[in-house]
């Protein structure tokens, strides 16, 4: 994500338009407490980070409260007074939406509608992945709102589902992060299950009259 300057690699994650995490990997300064200085306006004075991330006892990143700052982050990573990496970035291009909340399932015969609370901002995709023990890989369906209907399911099979949110690439670009997945939930015959058997259970023999 960040171009190397004096061997410094950076990563930016903007968590749900609320918190910005900037981390660095600087092999040349691996045993040094680098400091992080930032501002949200090009002509303001820099503030110093007050919430450092540590790795093996040394600073490796900074967490910033940036709720709805809708802006450019100007920052400088320094060794003492010497800047080792200075840059500025639109924060939105590093968006990581929050994980879906209040996920609900509504069954109707061979179809299920998965809903959750839409996030407060747009241009997102809500992706549902699902599989049964008979499937070799996850199937996927996504929509612009958290209202995803999956049809053609087999009512007798057990299905695992999970949901995540992604930023639309056309709008936010290729450097965003999908949200974490919601918890896996398992369903069979329209009822929630603790788990789906890893191996498909053989069909029960029909009882003779």
């Amino acid at each position: 994500q960040g171009g190397a300057a004096e061997g410094v690699q950076i990563q930016i994650i903007y968590f749900n338009l609320e918190t910005v995490q900037v981390t660095w990997n600087a092999s040349k300064y691996s045993r040094t407490n680098l400091t992080f200085h930032y501002r949200f306006n090009g002509d303001e004075a820099y503030d110093q980070c007050t919430n450092y991330l540590l790795q093996e006892g040394h600073t490796s990143g900074c967490l910033l409260d940036a709720e709805q700052r809708d802006d450019i982050l100007y920052f400088s990573i320094r060794n003492g007074t010497h800047p080792v990496f200075t840059a500025s970035r639109w924060m939105v291009y590093y968006l990581k939406p929050s994980s879906p909340k209040h996920v609900r399932f509504s069954w109707h015969q061979d179809a299920v509608t998965v809903t959750c609370s839409d996030l407060s901002y747009g241009d997102l995709l809500y992706e549902v992945q699902y599989r049964s023990p008979f499937d070799t890989e996850w199937q996927s369906k996504q929509e612009n709102t958290c209202n995803v209907t999956i049809e053609g399911l087999d009512a007798e099979k057990c299905y695992s589902f999970w949901v995540r949110v992604k930023a639309m690439e056309d709008v936010y670009g290729p450097d965003t992060y999908p949200s974490d997945w919601s918890e896996v939930t398992c369903w069979q015959r329209g009822e929630i299950r603790d788990a789906c058997a890893e191996t498909p259970t053989p069909p029960k023999p029909k009882l003779s009259k």
Partner: antibody, heavy 125, light 106 residues
Framework: QVQLVQSGAEVKKPGASVKVSCKAS????????ISWLRQAPGQGLEWMGW????????RYAQGFTGRFVFSLDTSVSTAYLQISSLKAEDTAVYYC??????????????????WGQGTLVTVSS | DIQMTQSPSSLSASVGDRVTITCRAS??????LAWYQQKPGQPPKLLIY???TRGSGVPDRFSGSGSGTDFTLTISSLRAEDVAVYYC????????FGQGTKLEIK
């Protein structure tokens, strides 16, 4: 359709002030940010900063603080650029432009799909 | 600042020619690059964004490519109405534009 209509050309003396307006139509004004850009005669384009039409929060690019003020009147879907203490080097065409993709809830991102027609400000004694 | 350098600064080509304009960023901007077309007396028009995505209503003879620091705008078959100044613009951070390429018909 989306339109940005700017006020007409201005001729001002050095030291005076000017206020350029940019009236938006065809969309919900507070949904997308407005940037201001300038183009000096025969020169390239320079981004001056932007204003969040939802919060009213202005952000100025380096070199455009002090004499330059962005403001809004959301009741008439209009953004304003005011320049004070005008200098000869402020002579330029000033454009307003709407952020094309990112909504004001999220912010701005520096891509300009919709532009005003431009306002020529001439500063001459 | 991220400096954007375009080349050539002007070029003359014949109708039907394939035309290429290049743009170089002073640092890695990934694919955060747009191309604009500006005709005399008009505001710029967005042609390309994300280095290669065509804007709405932009003819498919216009294409963009590149990532990192080196980018290209190509007009596959030049038409008379393509006479204009073309600008590249980065939006990795606060926007900066190239100095422009003036395209004329021979």
């Amino acid at each position: 359709q989306v339109q940005l209509v700017q006020s007409g050309a201005e001729v001002k003396k050095p030291g005076a002030s000017v206020k350029v307006s940019c009236k938006a139509s065809g969309y919900t004004f507070t949904t997308y940010g407005i940037s201001w850009l300038r183009q000096a005669p025969g020169q390239g384009l320079e981004w001056m900063g932007w204003v969040n039409t939802n919060t009213g929060n202005p952000r100025y690019a380096q070199g455009f603080t002090g004499r330059f003020v962005f403001s809004l009147d959301t009741s008439v879907s209009t953004a304003y650029l005011q320049i004070s203490s005008l200098k000869a080097e402020d002579t330029a065409v000033y454009y307003c432009a709407r952020e094309g993709f990112i909504t004001t809830v999220v912010g701005a991102a520096g891509r300009f799909v919709y532009w005003g027609q431009g306002t020529l400000v001439t500063v001459s004694s | 600042d991220i400096q954007m350098t375009q080349s050539p600064s002007s070029l003359s080509a014949s109708v039907g020619d394939r035309v290429t304009i290049t743009c170089r960023a002073s640092q890695d901007i990934h694919t955060r690059l747009a191309w604009y077309q500006q005709k005399p007396g008009q505001p710029p028009k967005l042609l390309i964004y994300w280095a290669s995505t065509r804007g709405s209503g932009v003819p498919d003879r216009f294409s963009g490519s590149g990532s990192g620091t080196d980018f290209t705008l190509t007009i596959s078959s030049l038409r008379a109405e393509d006479v204009a100044v073309y600008y590249c613009q980065q939006y990795s951070t606060y926007p900066t534009f190239g100095q422009g390429t003036k395209l004329e018909i021979k």
